[in-house]
């Protein structure tokens, strides 16, 4: 059975979100894909691939780049120079019609916050990485962290939270990590 989880990514302004959405090759290789933001109950399409999808033919709409790899069954999404107003819930979808889309797994909850006072914002190509490593301390993410996977003290000004609703885990039981290096 497939687990549906909502993944929460926290960034500072200026950083880059880089995620992937997988799909069934045999079903959707030639379908258009889209990246949408949920605004109220209505999703807003921010960018969509061409039809038919071509390998390594990126589509750029403002700060968003979509690159479909139909040979691999993957859609790569990049959102650069993140701003506070980019915060929200995002989804990859198979775009069949403006009013009919098939949602791919794992909606992304993006939270973008201002950088600390006195600290210049990260450059546009700063990337936040979801990663793991043996745990030393879990203080940085605080008590609201609810994840079945990883946790750690992240480097200054960058954290990632991956949450699964209804599966709260005590921080002291978490053995893996999310590490978020920041590129300057």
């Amino acid at each position: 059975t497939t687990e549906l989880t909502e993944e929460k990514y926290e960034y500072k302004e200026g950083q880059t979100l880089e995620v992937k959405c997988d799909y069934a090759l045999e079903k959707y290789a030639n379908s258009r894909k889209a990246w949408q933001k949920m605004e109220g109950k209505m999703p807003k399409i921010l960018a969509k691939t061409e039809r038919p999808s071509e390998n390594s033919h990126p589509v750029q709409v403002g700060r968003i780049t979509l690159e479909d790899y139909p040979d691999h069954g993957l859609l790569q999404v990049r959102m650069t120079n993140l701003q506070v107003e980019d915060s929200g819930l995002y989804q990859c979808v198979i775009y069949q019609h403006p009013k009919e889309s098939h949602v791919l797994f794992n909606p992304i909850c993006l939270v973008v916050t201002k950088g600390s006072s006195g600290t210049p914002g990260s450059s546009e190509n700063s990337t936040q990485n979801v990663y793991r490593t043996p745990s030393t301390t879990a203080k940085a993410l605080g008590p609201r962290y609810t994840s079945p996977r990883t946790v750690t003290q992240a480097p200054p000004e960058s954290t990632v939270v991956v949450s699964t609703p209804g599966s709260e885990i005590n921080l002291t039981n978490v053995t893996d990590i999310i590490r978020v290096p920041v590129f300057n």
Epitope: K20, C21, D22, E67, Q76, R78, F105, Y131, R149
Partner: antibody, heavy 122, light 107 residues
Framework: QVQLVQSGAEVKKPGASVKVSCKAS????????INWVRQATGQGLEWMGW????????GSVQKFRGRVTMTRNTSIHIAYMELSSLRSEDTAVYYC???????????????WGRGTLVTVSS | DIQMTQSPSSLSASVGDRVNITCQAS??????LNWYQQKPGKAPNLLIY???NLETGVPSRFSGSGSGTAFTFTISSLQPEDIATYYC?????????FGQGTRLEIK
Amino acid sequence: QVQLVQSGAEVKKPGASVKVSCKASGYTFTRYDINWVRQATGQGLEWMGWMNPNSGNSGSVQKFRGRVTMTRNTSIHIAYMELSSLRSEDTAVYYCARGGYTSSWRWYFDLWGRGTLVTVSS
Amino acid sequence: DIQMTQSPSSLSASVGDRVNITCQASQDIRKHLNWYQQKPGKAPNLLIYDAANLETGVPSRFSGSGSGTAFTFTISSLQPEDIATYYCQHYANLPITFGQGTRLEIK
């Protein structure tokens, strides 16, 4: 203990198929991609493809397309890689490797199996 | 496909030496580059991810730098246990490709 344990060495005849298994333990199997990388004797590393153990979706590089099948059994935390129509040049050590979190464009291979030697010989 | 060219293909150095290995990408891969160490008969081991980040548990004598198309892997003071083959690997796009490897020997 966080580890990937692979099945034992195989000897196959040209034209046959081989199915290599990779058992994950010590972490949440469905939350990280599983990748397959092979290495012919004395040669470099060659990425074959990936699988998302949660969705079951997978993809492979062009040269293996149609010959490789990646599957999994989530109840026992095992990933499988089956390669068909074997030829002598497929003789190699086949590694499974844990990739990044399934939704992240992070292709670090931070955990590897010990490898499975597949010999193709008539 | 992005080609990753490592140099040198092999090198011999003395214990305590500073060793540099370079990796050139055929196109811009930003910082999407990892370095692995592979000892004979063993699986590869991740040392550096995203060009410059040291994997947990890896000795601090290993480091990485670079972005775009040019990357360098450095061992600040070579130790006998560092005898291995070292590989770079990009993941800017698909397919993922590795460099051909650099075989490191002790003089």
